[in-house]
């Protein structure tokens, strides 16, 4: 025998107080596959979180952050603050990246300095708090006599620290 | 259903106090770090205060150190706010903010949030 649930679709739920009708879902809730037997409730944008998608009766509403938030986890479950560049968030709030270290974003963590020697290189533009050092070329080639130097590309945009 | 409420906002005036209190509900509250954010009008949301799980480990901006102490009561499920000196400038509404599951030195996110509770300072 078929079961009768399996016709509801989504949006509505078989109702066992009602000989398994199909009822729709209540208002603040949704159901967004066929054969459900109850409605989900639909999640709220509260607080941090701003409704980038209202809650229909197929599918749960969508929460971005309010700015000076970003979102973290799936489907944005969490909300973080967000710092200057040149800064982290730490346990005590932002603070600002110690020397040797920079942070070109207002998420992450500060990263250390790339270190120009490690590839031969001289420092060409010094490190802030803000921005990576710019390398150069290797100190034999600044030599008297050795042919000019091309200015090298910006050094180029590190990656998204591991949230 | 996970739930923070807030309470004990209300008028002052400078130089006053107040303590704000915010109930949990539907999770286990020990096992969270717990946040106090305020929002001035106009303005965009600010980090005031957290605390960790058992109360050891305190935090505060600092616009607020000296004059606010937050601390929690595990077995009463709540988190409080005790607002000491207050200026014109702390007017805003004051939410309570859950650490995000994984709260950790390599994320500060926040996950469930009360309604708030309006605070207004003024002579």
């Known amino acids: 025998l078929q079961d009768p649930c399996s016709n509801c679709p989504a949006g509505t739920f078989c109702d066992n107080n009602r000989n398994q009708i199909c009822s729709p879902c209540p208002p603040n809730s949704f159901s967004s596959a066929g054969g459900q037997r109850t409605c989900d409730i639909c999640r709220q944008c509260k607080g941090v979180f701003r409704t980038r998608k209202e809650c229909s009766s197929t599918s749960n509403a969508e929460c971005d952050c309010t700015p000076g938030f970003h979102c973290l986890g799936a489907g944005c479950s969490m909300c973080e603050q967000d710092c200057k560049q040149g800064q982290e968030l730490t346990k005590k709030g932002c603070k600002d990246c110690c020397f040797g270290t920079f942070n070109d974003q207002k998420r992450g963590i500060c990263r250390p300095w790339t270190n120009c020697s490690l590839d031969g290189k001289s420092v060409l533009v010094n490190g802030t708090k803000e921005r990576d050092v710019v390398c150069g070329p290797s100190p034999a080639d600044l030599s008297p006599g050795a042919s000019s130097v091309t200015p090298p590309a910006p050094a180029r945009e590190p990656g998204h620290s591991p949230q | 259903e996970v739930q923070l409420v807030e309470s004990g906002g209300g008028l002052v005036q400078p130089g006053g106090s107040l303590r704000l209190s915010c109930g949990a509900s539907?999770?286990?509250?020990?096992?969270?770090?717990m946040f106090w954010f305020r929002q001035a009008p106009g303005e965009g949301l600010e980090w005031v205060a957290n605390?960790?799980?058992?109360?050891?480990?305190?935090y505060y901006v600092d616009s607020v150190e000296g004059r606010f102490t937050i601390s929690r009561d595990n077995a009463k499920n709540s988190l409080y706010l005790q607002m000491n000196s207050l200026r014109a400038e702390d007017t805003a509404i004051y939410y309570c903010?859950?650490?995000?599951?994984?709260?950790?030195?390599?994320?500060?996110?926040?996950?469930?949030w009360g309604q708030g509770t309006t605070v207004t300072v003024s002579s």
């Open positions: 605390i960790n799980q058992d109360g050891s480990e305190k």
């Open positions: 539907g999770f286990t509250f020990s096992s969270y770090w």
């Open positions: 903010a859950r650490g995000g599951d994984g709260y950790s030195d390599s994320h500060y996110g926040t996950d469930v």
